[in-house]
Each structure stands twice: as structure tokens, then as C-alpha cells.
Amino acid sequence: QPDAINAPVTCCYNFTNRKISVQRLASYRRITSSKCPKEAVIFKTIVAKEICADPKQKWVQDSMDHLDKQTQTPKT
């Protein structure tokens, strides 16, 4: 889980070691702050859970691409 030590900076110290189905992901944000030990992606799931993931992993990149496309596609 992401950890906000000195709000408003949120950092990830561990990454999930499992792929999460892209269909369970609602949004993401990138963590690039120099105050954090590592770059990370925090996914928010459809049931509002937050998960730290490694941006170097292919499934994480695929998920971000998928979410980007979803937000670009206007709902009819």
C-alpha cells in the first residue's frame, strides 16, 4: 500500500508482485518525487483500493496505456 509519511508526498516502498486484471483498474498516478526512494505507479481499483506497482513492468505499462485510452474515449 502507498504510504504518506509527510503529506502531501505519497511514496511506495514495496510493489505488488502480482498482475492485477486491467479490468479492475480505475485510474493511476505516477510517483516521481525525489523524496521517495523509488519511482512508482499507484493504481486505484474499481473498489477504491490503492496498489503500488513497478513502472518498469510490462503489465503496468499496458495497464496505464489501457487507462489512458479509456479516458481519451468519450462515453456515448
Epitope: T16, K19, S21, Q23, A26, V47, W59
Partner: antibody
Amino acid sequence: QVQLVQSGAEVKKPGASVKVSCKVSGYTLTELSMHWVRQTPGKGLEWMGGFDPEDGETIYAQKFQDRVTMTEDTSTDTAYMELSSLRSEDTAVYYCATNDFWTGYYDYWGQGTLVTVSS
Amino acid sequence: DIVMTQSPDSLAVSLGERATINCKSSQSVLYSSNNKNYLVWYQQKPGQPPKTLIYWASTRESGVPDRFSGSGSGTDFTLTISSLQAEDVGVYYCQQYYTSPWTFGQGTKVEIK
């Protein structure tokens, strides 16, 4: 393509334990979240538990909480489901099931393992 | 936990006739941001694992005949077999995959009248 191959049928006495295996091929086990579902004779499908990547842990149906343990051997890509203190009502077909990264539902199932509990 | 309730428990339909199965969830399985219902329909035949027919409540799995269709949103869903064939005999289950624990309906047995 994920393939799930389960261990063979078992006959157990009441009070004993059974351990069913589910071997994954086509993917590695750590890429998947394995779940277990059972079907008692003439009854419906019953979710027993499985790995929830959103919580990062294995979760169990309340009904089985005290008696079931689900484990994984990542070196052999095999998932296990152990059910203890067996009773006759546990006679059922036990399935492992998982979903592909691009889907959310169970789109891959093992062939099922019949566990018969009889004295 | 979300409770899934199917009706009827069993159904006898003549060949070529329409079969309709209902599924009700105790809370909504619709995620409004993507407008998707996290509901799947499975068909199960004796001695076989379940087979996916419909996902997202209304999207047919590839290879599934178009006589199978799914509809509904939120908490009320329907699986329709427009013209029952002999090979459609089996038990049909709905399942929600919106939130864990994923839960199944109790099943509807479809037979030929």
C-alpha cells in the same frame, strides 16, 4: 493460453485432510491469481477462496475459513488447496480457476478433482 | 458479500422455444466510470467445468452462438436463449466479479420439455 491440470480423484475418511493440486502451464503462477471453487453433488458452484492481488493475500470464504489452506509452489507453478476435518458433505468436485490479465472473470478452469468422503 | 439470486431454479422449454433466466444481485455490480457491469454467465454440462457464455453482462464470448444473449444493468440481469437447441441442456450460473468474494447464483437447470 493458460492451462490448468489438476491432480486425480481422492477417497478420504471423515476427519482426514485432502490436498488437491493445480499445475499451471502457459503462464507462471505469479502472473495469475488462483481461486478454488467446489461443486457438491446436485448443487451449485461455491467459491472457496483464492489470491486477491488487490489485498496482496489469500482470502477465504467464511464457511471454509477454519478448514482450508491455499498455498503455492512458484518453483513448479503449482497451486494447492488443502481441506481438513473432512465430512461427508465435503464430497464434491473441486476446481481451480483463474482469469487472464485482460479479463476479470474466470476464463480458465482446471478439469476438476472429485473428492469422496466416506467411512 | 454480494448475494446473487437466480430464478427460476429449473426450466423446461421446447426445442426452438425461448428460455429466459434471471439473476439479481444484492448490490449493484455496475462501475459507473466505465459503464461496465461486472457480471458473467456460465454454462455447465455434467462432468465438465463451467464455460463462459457472456461477460460484462451482455458481451458474448467468442465462439458462443448468437442465440445466447445477456441484458440488464446494476442489479437485474437476464440470460436469453432465443431458440433452445438440444446441446443447450445444462446448468447456467451468473457470477459477479465486481468485488471479492466473487459470488455465484445458485444455478438454473435448463431441460427440454
